[in-house]
Every structure is written in C-alpha cells, then in structure tokens.
Amino acid sequence: MGARRLRVRSQRSRDSSVPTQCNQTECFDPLVRNCVSCELFHTPDTGHTSSLEPGTALQPQEGSALRPDVA
C-alpha cells in the first residue's frame, strides 16, 4: 500500500530565513508554509494508519484502496 507524497518546502516563512514559530494554539502547515489553527485536531478515521510525516498522506480510492506513490 502506498502513500501519495507531496513535495513540501522547509519550515520557513516566505519572507524570512527564520523558521516559522507558531503559538500554542496553532500548528505549522508545510503546504501553506504558515501557521494555522489546530485547536480542533482532525484526523478522519479511514481505517488506515496514516503517517503524519512531512509530505506524506494516504489517499483512499473506492473500496479504500490506496493510490501508488507519486513523486
């Protein structure tokens, strides 16, 4: 079973070489390269164990099959 992979940039803001620091009520999102609210954590139960490693996400298809890796 594969995981769809997204290239994500390093944890730095667009306008600075300093890593983005989020406050206690926020999470860093590498896709948007910014802090977002994460008071309500949301990980839908898809019946799969999804790694939250940077750039990795499971992508269920019909029948909960997974798509192969995409570079």
Epitope: R4, L6, C22, C27, F28, D29, P30, L31, V36, S37, C38, L40, F41, H42, T43, P44, D45, T46, S50, L52, E53, P54, G55, T56, A57, L58, Q59, P60
Partner: nanobody
C-alpha cells in the same frame, strides 16, 4: 466512511471560469481545514488553496492568487473552488483534501477521487 466527492470539472477555453464543488460526508466537516490540491498531466502534486474550518484563514498558491477563490458552506458540508481567468497551465486533476493535524503540524489527510479540468482553445 469518510467521503469526498468532487464535481464541476470539464473542458473550458482560456480566460473562462469554472466552479469546482466538493461534497463531504462521514466526518465533522465544520471542524476540518480543507485543501484543494492539483496534479497536472505528467507532473507532481501542487497545493492550490487552503481554507480553515471557520473560513477565517485562507491561503493561495502564488500561481492562482487573484484568479481562484476558495470557500465553504459548513451547513451543506461543501467546499468550493471558483476558478476565473483560466490558463492552459491550470489543466490538472483537482483534489479536495481534508487537513489532519497533530504534534504541532498539519498535513493532507483524506483525498477525494478528483475532478479533471482541461483548459484548451
């Protein structure tokens, strides 16, 4: 079962508009941040836009800024992407994706099946 069903794709001429819709079910849509992510033919995935659960925070990729508008209707469990001034380079499969957060970071979670947008004259 978590389901995301995209619609609204099609063939359109450059400069025209399309509106993509994502119908969500099987989870609490109103508390989930959502992404639109696309994949052009033969290319990698590209994040397009993000909207927070309450629509208070919205981000766009530089390539679509000023042309695309993301929105959501939590009462209808629906996510939208209004695409204006379409270009050939917008041709791609567009995916509606949930946001999953944990350990201080957020990443894509569950993906829809995608809807194809083709911009061609």
């Amino acid at each position: 079962e978590v389901q995301l069903v995209e619609s609204g794709g099609g063939v359109v001429q450059p400069g025209r508009s399309l509106r993509l819709t994502c119908a969500a079910s099987g989870f609490t849509f109103s508390t989930s941040g959502m992404y639109w992510i696309r994949q052009a033919p033969g290319k990698g995935l590209e994040w397009v836009s993000y909207i927070s659960s309450s629509s208070s925070t919205i981000y766009y990729a530089d390539s679509v800024k000023g042309r695309f508008t993301i929105s959501r209707d939590n009462s209808k469990n629906t996510l939208y992407l209004q695409m204006n001034s379409l270009r050939a380079e917008d041709t791609a499969v567009y995916y509606c994706v949930t946001q999953s957060c944990g350990a201080g970071k957020c990443y894509p979670g569950v993906w829809g099946q995608g809807t194809t947008v083709t911009v061609s004259s």
